[in-house]
């Protein structure tokens, strides 16, 4: 009778084991072991027992002890089970961002590991088990589906293998994959709201505001604002689940025409975009041209108004005839026209909006000087010793210089308060002088003496 010890061994891959082959007869003709494994016999006293060291055991094996005794030949097998933890435990790659409400399939691949009967694959979210299955196939694959929730944001998913050799008197060997950190997001189906001027004048600045509600996590949202090829640099303000991006936009003559204003919101691996057209226009103020801004009374003056070729103008409230970008009027300059404003209003239609521009010019009419009865009375009668203010106003443009002299030397204090004396009596010659000429007027002052009783 042949016996083997141990009859069952579990050992690590590449390990060694001592196997004892024994026989019940004292003088066996033969006693040995049959195995493809490298073996070394350890010398022992006696003939009915042999010990072999079997080394570099790479896979399960069944070495067989045999003996040949007088009563016949017999054999006994020992069962060597090799254990080793998996070579690779990996979660199949996934995009790190996943939309809330989507089904996410987690797939764990396990390469190798033995004995497979003791190998289990566990899918985890954090420390919570999602699925546990025995490892089957090469590679062993375990999958589970997770409905992505908002509160999964930042959660770590992993895959663990458990080689449980505790029933064989060994330990529980665990291997864990690199974690997959889930980033969940909500990007609403509604496009962002874009508020901007529909028209924008060359060499001016406009403000563009792009906003969107219902985002999660809002801090991770990227906002791209652009006008044509010009990237705008917005200031972004965040709310709980909303943002508002505000940017200044400057346009130049090169931008003239219809431009696309875009606001794109990127969150996770999705984006929402709003497009709007902005018309960039050039519309200089109309030009008011006077033949001469300063003319003498009686001169013929032409007032012209010229504007953008597509504009329609009115000059002093009178539309151009025919309606168009030019208007003019003719007048003979009178003193009343001095300081008169000529206002040209131009209207241009840009992208359905009416844009108004005004320009005003003032006409200066040179006239005078003038001295008339109303403003410079020819006769004053004042009681002696009374307080009086002689008034004489000369008119003209430019304003004339006025002097009133008696006998060519004694001045009348125009506009000053004086005490009336006898000396004040007499005829004065008032002379008004300007670059436009000179006029004179006689003014008589009578002084009434009080009656003494």
């Amino acid at each position: 009778q042949t016996s083997v010890s141990p009859s069952k061994v579990i050992l690590p891959r590449g390990g060694s084991v001592l196997v004892t082959c024994s026989t019940s007869c004292d003088q066996p003709k033969l006693l040995g072991i049959e195995t493809p494994l490298p073996k070394k016999e350890l010398l022992l006293p006696g003939n009915n027992r042999k010990v072999y060291e079997l080394s570099n055991v790479q896979e399960d094996s069944q070495p067989m002890c045999y003996s040949n005794c007088p009563d016949g030949q017999s054999t006994a097998k020992t069962f060597l089970t090799v254990y080793w933890t998996p070579e690779r435990v990996e979660l199949a790659p996934l995009p790190s961002w996943q939309p809330v409400g989507k089904n996410l399939t987690l797939r764990c691949q396990v390469e190798g590991g033995a004995p497979r009967a003791n190998l289990t694959v566990v899918l985890l979210r954090g420390e919570k088990e999602l699925k546990r299955e025995p490892a089957v196939g090469e590679p062993a694959e375990v999958t589970t589906t997770v409905l992505v929730r908002r509160d999964h944001h930042g959660a770590n998913f992993s895959c663990r293998t458990e080689l449980d050799l505790r029933p064989q008197g060994l330990e529980l060997f665990e291997n864990t994959s690199a974690p997959y950190q889930l980033q969940t997001f909500v990007l609403p189906a509604t496009p962002p709201q874009l508020v901007s001027p529909r028209v924008l004048e060359v060499d001016t600045q406009g403000t563009v505001v792009c906003s969107l509600d219902g985002l999660f996590p809002v801090s991770e949202a990227q906002v791209h604002l652009a006008l044509g090829d010009q990237r705008l640099n917005p200031t972004v303000t965040y709310g709980n689940d909303s943002f508002s991006a505000k940017a200044s936009v400057s346009v130049t003559a090169e931008d003239e025409g219809t431009q696309r204003l875009t606001c794109a919101v990127i969150l996770g691996n999705q984006s929402q975009e709003t497009l709007q057209t902005v018309t960039i226009y050039s519309f200089p103020a109309p030009n008011v041209i006077l033949t001469k801004p300063e003319v003498s009374e009686g001169t013929e003056v032409t007032v012209k108004c010229e504007a953008h070729p597509r504009a329609k103008v009115t000059l002093n409230g009178v539309p151009a005839q025919p309606l168009g970008p030019r208007a003019q009027l003719l007048l003979k300059a009178t003193p009343e026209d001095n300081g008169r404003s000529f206002s040209c209003s131009a209207t241009l239609e840009v992208a359905g909006q009416l844009i108004h521009k005004n320009q005003t010019r003032e006409l200066r009419v040179l006239y005078g000087p003038r001295l008339d009865e109303r403003d410079c009375p020819g006769n004053w009668t004042w009681p002696e010793n009374s307080q009086q203010t002689p008034m004489c106003q000369a008119w003209g443009n430019p304003l004339p210089e006025l002097k009133c002299l008696k006998d060519g030397t004694f001045p009348l204090p125009i506009g000053e308060s004086v005490t009336v004396t006898r000396d004040l009596e007499g005829t004065y010659l008032c002379r008004a002088r300007s670059t436009q000429g000179e006029v004179t007027r006689k003014v008589t002052v009578n002084v009434l003496s009080p009656r003494y009783e």
Partner: antibody, heavy 120, light 112 residues
Amino acid sequence: QVQLVQSGAEVKKPGASVKISCKGSGYTFTDYALHWVRQAPGQRLEWMGVISTYSGNTDYNQKFRGRATITVDTSASTAYMELSSLRSEDTAVYYCARSLYFGSSGFDYWGQGTALTVSS
Amino acid sequence: DVVLTQTPLSSPVTLGQPASISCRSSQTLVYRNGNTYLHWYLQRAGQPPRLLIYKVSNRFSGVPDRFSGSGAGTDFTLKISRVEAEDVGVYFCSQNTHFPYTFGGGTKLEIK
């Protein structure tokens, strides 16, 4: 004992296709993946692709993707490698080899090889 | 693709003497789990390759202990402590760390 037995030598014309088989025995067929490796004269060994004999999943070397197709018949414990649009450069000895799916412990057992000659 | 360069191309050795073959990789062969998937094969004339060493230094079943592997990162060595007649053939290194898997160009071991 573990054995991988491949089909016999093939001679093909350029543009044709060839299908080589590899039958596994002496082990649980679905416990290991099967890889295909070729050796052209004077060239280094070239890994072509792998199949999971359990699930049928495959991975290919980009160089052969679209031209090589690896399949498995578990009931016959046999894997197949079909190479289409053959050209003279495909003249080589084609081997199947047993291993883990990602080959982490090396290709422990190999078939005897199938010689393919592509000539007009 | 990862290129494995073997040196020497040919190595004439006296029986009973040691032999050494080098394999250098164009990039590190350390996988993200810390393991290094570099293997050695021997191909005798007219036969398929045979696995000798897996994962740098682990002898495969039935491989004599005169064969040993060492190295790390990008530099690896196969040593035969005492060459025997049956060791004649072409030795290949191979990597299964990066996709696609690649082989070295081979080193021919011959007896002087």
